[in-house]
């Protein structure tokens, strides 16, 4: 092909090539042709004769103002036609007359202000019709019943002001899963407008200034329809009462989106008419008081999003939002509750009472004063089968004994990004008999004891990053009870002292993060009592991160037991010479990171075993000594390996001898070196 199109598997991509005409030299068997973002003004039907196999044609983002009816004659198998972002203004009955197999027609962002006659009457197989971002002033798309297989009609961002039954009755035989009317200026729903449609399952009216009154009328018009999903996001619904959604009593609505409404007052029994509702989106509102009966009737809701729904009006404490006790008691089927980013004063004793199916609860950044978790804090969740609890970003400073004793089903507890500073006696976790993960990273300080985790032997993941960990060198180890642990993160704690039994018995450990500590002394031969082999016995360890610890020595047998190690990160240390057989047992190693150390020599006797099955190597920014003895083997290996070595050309540079300083390692000439073959 003389054009710069890329062709792969019968798909031709000719986008962004400044083309002014359709290429005539593409393979004739292509089924998908992408001509977007070019300078095409027309699509001569003759140019498509050779591409009769096309099922998808995308000519979006051009300057096409007219379509030849013969185009589809040449493309009998065409199913998807995308004409978005062009300059079409008129559609005649002939325009798509031969496009009888279309399932998708995209006409968004053109200049179509009116649909005359019946341009879509022949599209009996059409499933999606996108006319959004045009200048349409009505929903009138024809004068006779048509589009019987249409499922998605997208009319957002037009100038539609009224919905009329006589305009929508062309869909009398259609089952619309999605009628998208967002971002219009609708002010009227004429009687029977939705009944004109055969079946309407989804209606989207986001960014339409409905307000409480028009919303109520809308719902009355939706009565006795098949509506399942209703989206009214950003529709200026500032208040709801027990009549707002009355019309929906005669529907089986399962999804309702009321997000971004600045909703202030949720009156009692506002949703009493929605017993079938399952998914309820209320995020980004401004509810000042949730009454005990505000959510009454929502017996089937499984998912409720209240993110940023309760925000304070001013700095005055009196203006904090209120949630009455028992407000959620009606939600017997609720499984997922998101209450992130709110300004709720605290947790009352019956705040969550009645949520007998709740499995996921996010309370991240939810409270203005939740400094201490007591044994009463979560009493209202005692009968909830909660599996995941997120308490991040709440400025929690203390966890008292039995704080979670009500949560016997809990599997994941996230307490990260708080201000917890205390000795962990272990009583904090009492009752967490099924706990799988505790995330405590990014807190003030944690002092461990031998019993810190004595009551949670089921724990598999423990995250203790940047918590100013104290007493980690006690014996027995605080981690001794955690025989099921697979992930342990102790990074960023400036740990300088640990014992060789710190990880003893953790035979299931797979991931160990110890980066950004101060462990260098432990591996020095001059260490009193010799090096400390704190990695011994970790036979199932897969990932080991020891970055930024100041290591300048590695004892020869330190990785001896790590037979399953796949990834090791020793970057940003001060390593110069490594012992000959240090990696001998790492037969499964896939990734090795030694960047930013002081390595001058990469010899086979040290690195040969580690490099054997490597898929990724990072040794950037080391001061390589470009001599035969130091790097000949490495250079030959580099030039023959399939291992991924990022930035090999730019960041693997010789430091010595002086005449090679700054010279790329991979270009070092090994031809004069003896015995440097990388593979035997």
């Amino acid at each position: 092909s003389t054009t710069k199109c890329t062709v792969s598997h019968e798909v031709a991509d000719c986008s962004h090539l400044k083309l002014t005409q359709v290429p005539d030299d593409l393979p004739t068997n292509i089924t998908v042709l992408n001509l977007t973002h070019n300078q095409l003004r027309r699509l001569p039907a003759a140019n498509f004769t050779r591409y009769s196999q096309l099922t998808s044609l995308d000519v979006g983002f051009n300057t096409i103002s007219k379509l030849e009816p013969e185009l589809c004659q040449k493309l009998p198998m065409l199913k998807v036609l995308n004409l978005q972002h062009n300059e079409l203004s008129q559609l005649s009955d002939k325009t798509f007359a031969f496009c009888t197999n279309l399932t998708e027609l995209h006409l968004m962002s053109n200049s179509i202000q009116k649909i005359k006659n019946n341009p879509f009457v022949k599209q009996k197989n059409l499933i999606t019709l996108d006319l959004s971002h045009n200048g349409l002033s009505s929903t009138k798309l024809g004068t006779q019943v048509q589009l019987e297989n249409l499922q998605e009609l997208l009319l957002s961002n037009n100038k539609i002001q009224a919905l009329k039954s006589e305009e929508l009755d062309i869909f009398a035989n259609s089952s619309l899963k999605k009628l998208e009317l967002s971002s219009n200026q609708i002010k009227e729903f004429s009687p029977g407008c939705f009944h004109a449609i055969g079946r309407l399952f989804g209606l989207f009216l986001n960014n339409v200034q409905l307000g409480p009154s028009l919303t109520e009328k809308l719902c009355l018009e939706l009565a006795n329809t098949s509506i399942r999903n209703l989206s009214l996001s950003n529709s200026q619904l500032s208040t709801t009462s027990n009549t707002t959604f009355l019309g929906l009593k005669w529907t089986n609505l399962t999804m309702l989106d009321l997000s971004y409404n600045n909703l202030n007052v949720v009156g009692n029994d506002s949703f009493a008419w929605l017993p079938q509702l399952e998914y309820f989106f209320l995020e980004y509102n401004n509810i000042q008081h949730l009454f005990s009966h505000s959510l009454h009737g929502l017996f089937n809701v499984r998912y409720l999003n209240l993110k940023r729904s309760f925000t304070k009006q001013s700095i005055s404490l009196a203006s904090l939002p209120k949630i009455d006790d028992f407000s959620f008691q009606w939600l017997k089927c609720l499984e997922h509750l998101n209450m992130e980013d709110n300004d709720i004063p605290g947790i009352k004793s019956n705040m969550f009472t009645g949520l007998i199916n709740l499995k996921y609860l996010s309370l991240s950044n939810s409270f203005t004063s939740l400094r201490t978790l007591t044994n009463e804090t979560f009493v209202s969740l005692a009968h909830s089968p909660l599996h995941i609890l997120n308490l991040t970003k709440n400025k929690i400073s203390k966890i008292e004994s039995d704080a979670f004793s009500w949560l016997g089903h809990l599997e994941v507890l996230d307490l990260g990004l708080n201000e917890i500073g205390q000795e962990l006696t272990g009583q904090e976790w009492r009752g967490l008999e099924n706990i799988f993960e505790i995330y405590l990273s990014y807190n003030k300080y944690l002092q461990l004891t031998r019993n810190s985790f004595a009551l949670v032997p089921s724990l598999q993941r423990l995250m203790l990053r940047r918590v100013a960990l104290k007493n980690v060198d006690s014996s027995p180890s605080p981690f001794q009870p955690l025989r099921n642990l697979t992930i342990l993160d102790l990074s960023n704690n400036n740990i300088a002292n640990i014992n060789d039994d710190m990880l003893e018995g953790l035979e299931k450990l797979e991931i160990l993060d110890l980066q950004h500590n101060n462990l260098a002394r432990l591996w020095k031969h001059a260490n009193p009592g010799g090096p400390i082999y704190f990695l011994k016995g970790l036979s199932h360890l897969h990932i080991l991160n020891l970055e930024s610890n100041g290591f300048d020595e590695i004892p020869v047998e330190v990785f001896k037991d790590l037979f399953e190690l796949k990834i090791i990160d020793l970057g940003l240390n001060n390593l110069n010479t490594l012992p000959a057989s240090v990696f001998n047992n790492q037969v499964s190693l896939k990734s090795l990171n030694l960047q930013k150390n002081l390595i001058t020599s990469v010899e086979k006797k040290v690195f040969g075993p580690a490099f054997r099955n490597l898929t990724e190597l990072d040794m950037r920014f080391n001061p390589f000594d470009c001599t035969c003895e130091s790097i000949a083997w490495f250079v030959n290996w580099i030039n023959e390996t399939h291992t991924n070595i990022p930035e090999l050309s730019s960041h693997y540079l010789c430091n010595t001898p002086p005449h090679y300083h700054g010279f790329p390692v991979r270009l070092f000439d090994t031809s004069s070196c003896k015995d440097s073959a990388p593979f035997e």
């Epitope: 272990g426 031998r450 019993n451 009551l455 001794q480 009870p481 003893e504 035979e507 016995g537």
Partner: antibody, heavy 119, light 107 residues
Framework: QVQLVQSGAEVKKPGASVKVSCKAS????????IHWVRQAPGQGLEWMGE????????NYNEKFKTRVTMTRDTSISTAYMELSRLRSDDTAVYYC????????????WGQGTLVTVSS | DIQMTQSPSSLSASVGDRVTITCRAS??????LAWFQQKPGKAPKSLIY???TLADGVPSRFSGSGSGTDFTLTISSLQPEDFATYYC?????????FGQGTKLEIK
């Protein structure tokens, strides 16, 4: 199943030493600390100390620190407790014990070794 | 060191009786308290740990309660095989001291 089998009864003279053994089976010896507890005739139980069979690290009860030595031989999965400078009030049954999944109780005990100190 | 004080030191009761033994710690041991049963010539047997959790195979007539410094072992309906000596022991910090024992005898 986990078993702790102790050595037989001993009779010792005051001032002598005694070494009691505790052979473990049914689990990996090096992964659980071994504790020693004694009981004088007609008296209560007294915790003496604990040893990590993996590295030999020990936490003693201060009361016994100067006279007790706890050791282990991992090759034969055996822990030892040696008490020196024996006195008559050291006459007791000496037990070894081990924690379980919960490290806050002793589900496993040896059968006990009676040490009699008599001139 | 934390001292453990058990009471009473001995107790006479009949089969079917409800019996309560108490144990007081000289400092806060949270809930790290275990109860053991010992019969003459035998090693102690674990009954309860973490103040209230029943050890494997222990009949439900045994129960434990308490937290901090005051703890209780209750036998709801004494059976003939329950006559023995009972000890509490803390597991908060070394040394793991025992109570002096409570001898439960047939009345």
């Amino acid at each position: 199943q986990v078993q702790l089998v102790q050595s037989g009864a001993e009779v010792k003279k005051p001032g002598a030493s005694v070494k009691v053994s505790c052979k473990a089976s049914g689990y990996t010896f090096t992964t659980y600390w071994i504790h020693w507890v004694r009981q004088a005739p007609g008296q209560g139980l007294e915790w003496m100390g604990e040893i990590n069979p993996n590295n030999g690290r020990i936490n003693y009860n201060e009361k016994f620190k100067t006279r007790v030595t706890m050791t282990r031989d991992t090759s034969i999965s055996t822990a030892y407790m040696e008490l020196s400078r024996l006195r008559s009030d050291d006459t007791a049954v000496y037990y070894c014990a081990r924690v379980g999944v919960m490290i806050t109780t002793f589900p496993y005990w040896g059968q006990g070794t009676l040490v009699t100190v008599s001139s | 060191d934390i001292q453990m004080t058990q009471s009473p030191s001995s107790l006479s009761a009949s089969v079917g009786d409800r019996v309560t033994i108490t144990c007081r710690a000289s400092g806060n041991i949270h809930n790290y308290l275990a109860w053991f049963q010992q019969k003459p010539g035998k090693a102690p047997k674990s009954l309860i740990y973490n103040a209230k959790t029943l050890a494997d195979g222990v009949p439900s007539r045994f129960s434990g309660s308490g937290s901090g410094t005051d703890f209780t072992l209750t036998i709801s309906s004494l059976q003939p095989e329950d006559f023995a000596t009972y000890y509490c022991q803390h597991f908060w910090s070394t040394p793991f001291t025992f109570g002096q024992g409570t001898k439960l005898e047939i009345k």
